[in-house]
């Protein structure tokens, strides 16, 4: 029977700069029941506080609700592991909420095949930003990435969409069912998880265009860029 091993705070994330959660990995338990507590202070202060909510984030976590979250302050935190034989402390972790934002995935991904009479058909997709993010305040700039693949393909084709919430692509395989997903990230943060896959059957009469893919910066009337397959393989990871 031994004192507990050293725990490690390995991740802190905020969905929207208004709340955040940190998670730790326990060290060895020393063969005895072990209690964990997270304590923190704000940089420039000496007053220590204990984690306000050990429940919301699941096991081995600390959740900071709105009233405990300040955007302009750095948090200094550590985890204490204690059993009957003694204690051990994690290293201190410095957390600035501005840099730990990981939004929820975008919502309402809509995918349609458009077949205008006068132009080549294309796949059009649009989506909405996650509900927790208020883009109107200017606190956030969200960047988007979409990926798609035929249902049975192992490799995804990924496209960076910038700040736009619409996108269109030529060059699809007729008669295939495609999966499409979208994710987002703030300018100083982490990519969200991918949204659930939306799927669409490409008609058998869809005209394949091998040479080019179309990427639009806005709606149908917006600026359009034609990118060759060679460029695409160079600029977009698969």
């Amino acid at each position: 029977q031994l004192p507990p091993g050293k725990p490690e705070i390995f991740k802190c994330r905020s969905p929207n700069k208004e709340t955040f959660t940190c998670w730790w990995r326990p060290g060895t338990d020393g063969g005895l029941p072990t209690n964990y507590s997270l304590t923190y202070h704000r940089e420039g202060e000496t007053l220590m506080h204990e984690c306000p909510d050990y429940i919301t984030g699941g096991p081995n976590s600390c959740h900071f609700g709105k009233q405990y979250t300040s955007m302009w302050r750095t948090y200094v935190m550590m985890v204490n592991a204690t059993n009957q034989m003694g204690s051990s402390f994690s290293d201190e972790l410095y957390v600035d909420v501005t840099y730990i934002v990981q939004p929820d995935p975008p919502l309402e991904l809509t995918v349609e095949v458009k077949q205008p009479e006068d132009r080549k058909p294309y796949l059009w997709m649009k989506w909405s930003p996650p509900t927790l993010i208020d883009l109107k305040t200017g606190w956030f700039t969200l960047l988007y990435e979409i990926r798609l693949k035929p249902e049975k393909a192992a490799e995804w084709e990924t496209h960076f969409a910038g700040q736009q919430t619409e996108f269109k692509i030529l060059s699809l395989h007729p008669g295939q069912k495609y999966l499409v997903q979208v994710r987002c990230k703030p300018d100083h943060g982490y990519w969200s998880a991918w949204s659930p896959a939306t799927f669409i059957q490409i008609p058998s009469d869809f005209i394949m265009n091998d040479e080019q893919k179309l990427i639009s910066e806005e709606d149908l009337g917006g600026e359009q860029k034609l990118i060759s397959e060679e460029d695409l393989h160079h600029h977009h990871h698969h």
Epitope: E108, L109, T110, K152, A154, W156, P196, A197, T198, F199
Partner: antibody, heavy 114, light 107 residues
């Protein structure tokens, strides 16, 4: 012909863990993200989570936080779902489901009883 | 979490008649909605995805409509094999959720 074949029925005691397997054929696991769905006797369907073998990412319903682990072995095209700290209300048929929802395993009955 | 509400809980219909099943989402799910049929002792079977696109092998008597928060599954002329449980499910965002189901029984 895509098929998902699951492991057989299990009886477990409260507090124990169960690991259900889902063997994919007619497809490679790397191309197929897997959902796990369960159905308690006489009840509706409940989504548990999703495992994407391509990047190893998992997403799960909040109620299973800390209890469910979804993994996959791409060398055998097999996905796994492990549920720990079992209680009687976890008694259910557990299904693995392909990403587009048109491929379902046959289901695995897990009974939790002392 | 988006709550999916199906109505009615039970629908009694005569063979050959039309059945209309409703599914309501607590917030918009765009067209990211699927319908399933489940018979006793069997896994669910996908009928429709994208709110209105029939899955492979599904007869034309099954049709779906709606977007946003209100969705409908219509079975134009019920066959004996259509008497079963029907579920809707959204895949708009995590977590995915199912409706409570509608049982279509013989009148």
């Amino acid at each position: 012909q895509v098929q998902l074949v699951q492991s057989g029925a299990e009886v477990q005691k409260p507090g124990a863990s169960v690991k259900v397997s889902c063997k994919v054929s007619g497809y490679t696991l790397t191309a197929l993200s897997i959902h796990w769905v369960r159905q308690a006797p006489g009840k509706g369907l409940e989504w548990m989570g999703n495992f994407d073998p391509g990047d190893g990412e998992t997403i799960h319903a909040q109620k299973f936080q800390g209890r469910v682990t979804m993994t996959g072995d791409t060398s055998t095209d097999t996905a796994y779902m492990e549920l720990s700290s079992l209680r009687s209300e976890d008694t259910a048929v557990y299904y693995c489901v392909g990403v587009t929802f048109d491929y379902w395993g046959q289901g695995t009955l897990v009974t939790v009883s002392s | 979490e988006i709550v999916m509400t199906q109505s009615p809980a039970t629908l009694s219909v005569s063979p050959g008649e039309r059945a209309t099943l409703s599914c309501r989402a607590s917030q918009s799910v765009a067209s990211n909605l699927a319908w399933y049929q489940q018979k006793p002792g069997q896994a669910p079977r996908l009928l429709l995805y994208g709110a209105s696109t029939r899955a492979t092998g599904i007869p034309a008597r099954f049709s779906g409509s709606g977007s946003g928060t209100e969705f409908t599954l219509t079975i134009s002329s019920l066959q004996s094999e259509d008497f079963a449980l029907y579920y809707c499910q959204h895949y708009n965002n995590w977590p995915l959720t199912f409706g409570g189901g509608t049982k279509v029984e013989i009148k």
